[in-house]
Amino acid sequence: GSVPPMVNVTRSEASEGNITVTCRASSFYPRNITLTWRQDGVSLSHDTQQWGDVLPDGNGTYQTWVATRICQGEEQRFTCYMEHSGNHSTHPVPSGNSHHHHHHHH
């Protein structure tokens, strides 16, 4: 069977006026997954995102991540889109005073 991923979005200060947002998917099986950042519902081009390898996490499941840099103040326009085993979900960037959130998808 399949195990849905835990999805966790974090933000960190990059340069003045910019932040780096990172979307991590973990504890999923099988290893095939789509993880991408979207602006206004449209997938960003590949060269504006950085991807981690899909790696085993030691529990028979896998983990990966994707990051991009965005302008501070435009967080609400960006979402992390995840697709795995026919299921999909979107995950917002947390507000500045809350540094992460995560969801497990069934």
Epitope: Q39, D40, V42, L44, R77, Y81, G86
Partner: antibody, heavy 119, light 108 residues
Framework: DVHLVESGGGLVQPGGSRKLSCAAS????????MNWVRQAPEKGLEWVAY????????YYADTVKGRFTISRDNPKNTLFLQMTSLRSEDTAMYYC????????????WGQGTLVTVSA | QIVLTQSPAFKSSSLGERVTMTCTAS???????LHWYQQKPGSSPKLWIY???NLASGVPARFSGSGSGTSYSLTISTMEAEDAATYYC?????????FGSGTKVEIK
């Protein structure tokens, strides 16, 4: 009020080129994604191309990929569509559209400019 | 690419009638990335329903939208003369973005 005004349409010979422009006003142009959508006479809508606010994400319909180029000049509030190797099937009304922030969708449309490809 | 199939292609309705049209996607899409447009002859299209079920500004409450996965619909609860138009669904779940071929609604 948001205004989108297309120009540059007209009669073009097959194999020819044409550059369409869209003058935008009434909103902060450099923060919005933009698109071109076309409609052949008595036919349905066909999306042509998308460009995001920073010009670093661009997508094209398969029917125009390699022949059309979407671009924008943010300081001049203008969107462009460079069309080359034009074919009869490119004959259509070309609409400039503004992409809705957050939710997506073509929230504003111009009145269109007609491109006719014919010998 | 994701193909959107609209049915019926043509609908003739009486005033006051309930009208439903469907949009079927060739593969599953997120309801966040499905929108509807209304177009009247000689005019530019207008965003009518966004993200499957939200009415655009100025759209009468007799319109509604619903759906998920591969099946979406637009419903007019009581047809009025001003609703005669062509309605298109549109997806941006995956590039290339696509439109359905449209449902033309006319007054009987």
């Amino acid at each position: 009020d948001v205004h989108l005004v297309e120009s540059g349409g007209g009669l073009v010979q097959p194999g020819g080129s044409r550059k369409l422009s869209c003058a935008a006003s009434g909103f902060t142009f450099n923060t919005f994604g933009m698109n071109w959508v076309r409609q052949a006479p008595e036919k349905g809508l066909e999306w042509v191309a998308y460009i995001n606010s920073g010009s670093n994400t661009i997508y094209y319909a398969d029917t125009v990929k390699g022949r059309f180029t979407i671009s924008r000049d943010n300081p001049k509030n203008t969107l462009f569509l460079q069309m080359t190797s034009l074919r009869s099937e490119d004959t259509a009304m070309y609409y400039c559209t503004r992409w809705e922030p957050v939710t997506g969708g073509f929230s504003y449309w111009g009145q269109g400019t007609l491109v006719t490809v014919s010998a | 690419q994701i193909v959107l199939t609209q049915s019926p292609a043509f609908k003739s309705s009486s005033l006051g009638e309930r009208v439903t049209m469907t949009c079927t996607a060739s593969s599953s899409i997120s309801s966040s990335y499905l929108h509807w447009y209304q177009q009247k002859p000689g005019s530019s299209p207008k965003l009518w329903i966004y993200t499957t079920s939200n009415l655009a500004s100025g759209v009468p409450a007799r319109f509604s939208g619903s759906g998920s996965g591969t099946s979406y619909s637009l419903t007019i609860s009581t047809m009025e003369a001003e609703d005669a138009a062509t309605y298109y669904c549109h997806q941006h779940h995956r590039s290339p973005f696509t439109f359905g071929s449209g449902t033309k609604v006319e007054i009987k």
